[in-house]
């Protein structure tokens, strides 16, 4: 009864729910939920039944395997989907998939909040910016990675002349897409023309 | 939540019909079916019959077929039940229950609260 | 149609007490057993489907066990919400029976 999956798919796409393990032989039922009691569709060894539900049009089920085909996700099919087979024996097994449908990330600006000089050393800060999304910052000076420490939407540091950059790339990423953003300075300290 | 809403008690003379209604929320209407049980004063459960929201399909106790006719309404999510030719013997609670599937498994998983239903002269 | 048979018809029992409810299918039925329980005046409640498996939101002091032609219901530890009227039911084929209920009474 236990079974629980994590997906994680970019908007847009087609997903395929399915389990990793062959269905239970003969069964009697095969039923999809989203939540529970929301039903989307089931097969009863006669034909599939597909409820209204804002899935309808967009689903299709493979009694064969049980998979589930979904197309065109949005974030809003963000839920804990289930499937539940009925077998001839009347015991039940269930299997729970949990579906996260991300956005593909925007491209980020890089806002440069302060840059000065200072007895040869450079005082950088720089800030990433994208609109309000849940995603990972990667700065990197001239493609090396910053320190794991300075990795968050804002980039505070202060630079010496053996470790100058002359552009800084901010990259902004969650589990489906990544996209960067670069400044370039011309040394010692001022921001390049672009 | 799910919920299944029975309609109110009825008095009935010998031979006339009754129409009970079992309105249900919280779920996929079509995507059950809808069992009924009655209950005699005293007495234990006996299954009447089952009726799929999905298309209609229904399957009745032998001892009432002919006199019962089960049907649904799924642009309000409500189950009918209606018994002919009553009986004194047909007083009893009259319940709905959701079975989990739409085609019948037989499993009820939600009951409605019952309606009492006397058959008096 | 097959017949299901609850022993003891009544049970006296305390709080705290393990209190077991036999069920006998007149033909075997596999795993395709529920069990329900009623309070006076109020509509049944499932507890148990397919011989084993709890309902949503039933405390996991009720446990149901069994195949074929032999079911058990248990109640390890009985709670004074508990004392009540407890029905197996088969669902392997039309028409669906009842067993005729076992009462939980306090002792």
């Known amino acids: 009864q236990g079974h629980l999956v994590h997906m994680t798919v970019v908007s847009g796409s087609n997903v395929t729910l399915n389990i990793s393990e062959s269905l239970p032989e003969n069964y009697k039922q095969l039923t999809w939920f989203y939540t529970f009691d929301q039903k989307i569709v089931e097969w009863d060894s006669r034909k599939s039944k597909y409820f209204e539900s804002k899935f309808k049009g967009r689903v299709r089920l493979d009694p064969q395997s049980g998979a589930l085909y979904i197309s065109k996700v949005q974030k809003e099919d963000n839920s804990t989907y289930i499937m539940r087979v009925l077998k001839k024996t009347g015991n039940e097994q269930e299997w729970k998939i949990k579906l996260q449908v991300l956005d593909p990330v925007p491209k980020p600006v890089i806002k440069i909040e302060k840059i000065e000089d200072m007895d040869d050393n450079c005082y950088l800060k720089l800030s990433c910016v994208i609109p309000g999304e849940s995603v990972n910052y990667t700065w990197y000076g001239d493609k090396r990675p910053f320190p794991k420490e300075l990795q968050n939407s804002v980039l505070e540091t202060t630079l010496m002349p053996h470790n100058y950059s002359r552009c800084y790339t901010c990259q902004v990423s969650n589990s489906v897409s990544s996209k960067n953003g670069t400044v370039c300075l011309s040394p010692p300290c001022t921001l390049a023309r672009s | 939540q799910v919920r299944l809403v029975e309609s109110g008690a009825e008095v009935k003379k010998p031979g006339a019909s009754v129409k009970v209604s079992c309105k249900t929320s919280g779920y996929t209407f079509a995507g059950y079916g809808i069992t009924w049980v009655r209950q005699a004063p005293g007495r234990g459960l006996e299954w009447m019959g089952w009726v799929s929201a999905y298309n209609g399909d229904t399957d009745y106790a032998q001892s009432l077929q002919g006199r019962v006719t089960m049907t649904t309404d799924t642009s309000t999510s409500t189950a009918y039940m209606e018994l002919r030719s009553l009986r004194s013997d047909d007083t009893a609670m009259y319940y709905c229950?959701?079975?989990?599937?739409?085609?019948?498994?037989?499993?009820?998983?939600?009951w409605g609260q019952g309606t009492l239903v006397t058959v008096s002269s | 149609d097959i017949v299901m048979t609850q022993s003891p018809s009544s049970v006296s029992a305390s709080v705290g007490d393990r209190v077991t409810i036999t069920c006998r299918a007149s033909q075997g039925i596999s795993s395709w057993l529920a069990w329900h329980q009623q309070k006076p005046g109020k509509a049944p409640k499932v507890l148990i489907y397919?011989?084993?498996s709890l309902h949503s939101g039933v405390p996991s002091r009720f446990s149901g066990s069994g195949s074929g032609t032999e079911f058990t219901l248990t109640i390890s530890s009985l709670q004074p919400e508990d004392f009540a009227t407890y029905y197996c039911q088969q669902a392997n084929t039309f028409p669906y029976t009842f067993g005729q209920g076992t009462k939980v009474e306090i002792k």
């Open positions: 397919a011989a084993s």
């Open positions: 229950a959701r079975d989990r599937y739409s085609s019948s498994s037989g499993y009820f998983d939600y």
